[in-house]
């Protein structure tokens, strides 16, 4: 409680914020937890405290600790704890997890990123960015104050985005990058209620006993990337892993598929060598999502086969 | 939304005790000082004190601080105030309140409906 | 403890006048609190840090001042704004109170 997870890079600068506020007016002391040694409030030291925020110029791995800020309100002296790792830098491209900010989500009318924790750093405009370590050219991108925004944003455009910036402190730079993950998502994107597709309600199916058959049960839910969507089968009500009855199984994984620009999907019913006792099953389609669920019934019936005599 | 439900009135006499509950609801108990207030009639208010449900550390107000004692359970997210050796100038409502913003100290914001305490031979 | 002077003790408008309360304070405070109460409510609280306006208070409210001077402004008095005013400093403890404004509609 009252704890917050901070990280950087050896070498750059790192600046935390004590996670109890309080009013600029209050007096907040820094103490590195282990030693309850107190930090040091003037700026000519390498790690030393400045009210709220606890400042890394320029972080050391050896920093990395837990410090203890107490801020010092007219009631109650009210404490906090700041959980700092300082890792060594990748050789390689790789930003590592354990190294990432929020994942934040985009679309076509808003592909926004935001640079992570800028605003406790004295910085200057421009910002520079970093796609997959790449450095981001061309006119669809523009750096704009603290946050990068994409023009005309394509799915191509997820992936990790590193911006870097310069913090001054008392005519000193220091170098400062942060990494987070950017998603594209369709913001066109509805759900509905599932409309199955396959197959029709109450459908007959005609079969041949000792042959394969197969039925898609195909739904559709809405546009855009769907969320909690499945269709599955049941055999006289019971899941098809419950029904025991190894002849018959659900193809593996489902199949999504755009129709028209709906999101879809389809899962195919095998059944193997049918049997006179399979037509006495009723098999039902169902499809769920947030909104409900849908059921369509088949039956199957004997497919007699064709007499050439006749 | 955030609520704060005070126990019923009570009538006392002189040198007795009383101890006026506040319930909690609609927050984290703990993550908020409790203080409490109170106003004689026709009087103006005053503060009496603070409690932190979290460690049960408390802050007197120096003119009450030999009578008055802040208490908070946290299973049921209560708060207590007990006034001892009363007198007939304790006569008042008791109010418990809540700033918005615990470490802005940004006012009270949440209020409690009150306790009136009458105390009469 | 910081003493907390609050003038006038009555105020006595018509609808749609200004009313300026004043609360004069014994030593500098960085913050001044606003209430509002009425016969047999709990405080409400009005204004917070000496100018924001807490949630649903009408715009017509307003508060300013610094160090030991503070002041509550209603711009153009509503029936409705008849109650004791009070101001409370969170800058020391004890925290205190003002003794009240009690503003009266004609």
């Known amino acids: 409680k009252f704890s917050k997870q901070s990280w950087g890079l050896e070498n750059e600068a790192l600046i935390v914020r004590c996670p109890r506020q309080g009013k600029p007016s209050y007096t907040v002391d820094w103490y590195y937890s282990q030693t309850n040694k107190s930090i040091p409030t003037q700026e000519r030291n390498r790690v030393f405290a400045s009210g709220q925020l606890l400042k890394f110029l320029p972080a050391a791995v050896a920093d990395s600790g837990i410090y203890t800020c107490i801020v010092r309100s007219p009631t109650f002296n009210r404490t906090g704890y700041a959980n700092v790792t300082i890792y060594k830098k990748q050789s390689d491209c790789n930003v590592p997890d354990y190294l990432m900010y929020s994942t934040v989500s985009g679309s076509e009318k808003n592909s926004k990123i935001y640079c992570p924790t800028i605003d406790l750093y004295n910085w200057t405009a421009p910002l520079e960015w970093f796609k997959n370590c790449q450095a981001l050219q061309g006119s669809r991108y523009r750096a704009h104050k603290s946050f990068l925004v994409i023009d005309n944003v394509m799915t191509e455009d997820a992936g990790d985005y590193t911006c870097k910036f310069i913090h001054n402190e008392n005519g000193a730079n220091y170098s400062v990058t942060a990494t987070r993950s950017f998603t594209v998502k369709d913001e066109q994107g509805f759900s509905l209620f599932p409309v199955i597709g396959a197959p029709a309600q109450n459908e007959i199916k005609e079969v041949e006993i000792g042959k394969n058959a197969n039925l898609t049960c195909s739904a559709c839910f809405g546009k855009g990337t769907q969320f909690l969507a499945a269709v599955l089968w049941q055999l006289n009500g019971t899941k098809i892993t419950d029904f025991g009855e190894p002849r018959i199984q659900q193809e593996e994984g489902q199949n999504q598929s755009f129709s028209n620009g709906l999101a879809c999907l389809d899962m195919v019913l095998r059944i193997a060598d049918v049997k006179e006792e399979d037509l006495l099953l009723q098999y039902d389609c169902l499809a769920l999502n947030l909104h409900g669920l849908r059921r369509h019934t088949v039956r199957l019936s004997r497919k007699n086969p064709i007499d050439h005599h006749s | 939304q955030v609520q704060l439900v005070q126990s019923g009135a009570e009538v006392k006499k002189p040198g007795a005790s009383v101890k006026v509950s506040c319930k909690a609801s609609?927050?984290?108990?703990?993550?908020?000082?409790l203080h409490w207030v109170r106003q004689a009639p026709g009087q103006g208010l005053e503060w009496m004190g603070t409690i932190d449900p979290e460690t049960g550390d408390t802050v007197y107000n120096q003119k009450f601080k030999a009578r008055v004692t802040m208490t908070a359970d946290k299973s049921t997210s209560t708060a207590y105030m007990e006034l001892s050796s009363l007198r007939s100038e304790d006569t008042a409502v008791y109010y418990c309140?809540?700033?918005?913003?615990?470490?802005?100290?940004?006012?009270?914001?949440?209020w409690g409906q009150g306790t009136l305490v009458t105390v009469s031979s | 403890e910081i003493v907390m002077t609050q003038s006038p003790a009555t105020l006595s408008l018509s609808p749609g006048e200004r009313a300026t309360l004043s609360c004069s304070v014994s030593s500098s405070v960085s913050y001044m609190h606003w209430y509002q109460q009425k016969p047999g409510q709990a405080p409400r609280r009005l204004i917070y840090?000496?100018?924001k306006l807490a949630s649903g208070i009408p715009a017509r409210f307003s508060g300013s001042g610094s160090g030991t001077d503070y002041t509550l402004t209603i711009s153009s008095l509503e029936p409705e704004d008849a109650a004791v005013y009070y101001c409370q400093q969170w800058n020391s403890s004890p925290l205190t109170f003002g003794g009240g404004t009690k503003v009266e509609i004609k």
């Open positions: 609609g927050y984290t108990f703990t993550d908020y000082e």
């Open positions: 309140t809540r700033a918005f913003y615990n470490d802005y100290d940004d006012a009270f914001a949440y």
């Open positions: 840090d000496t100018s």
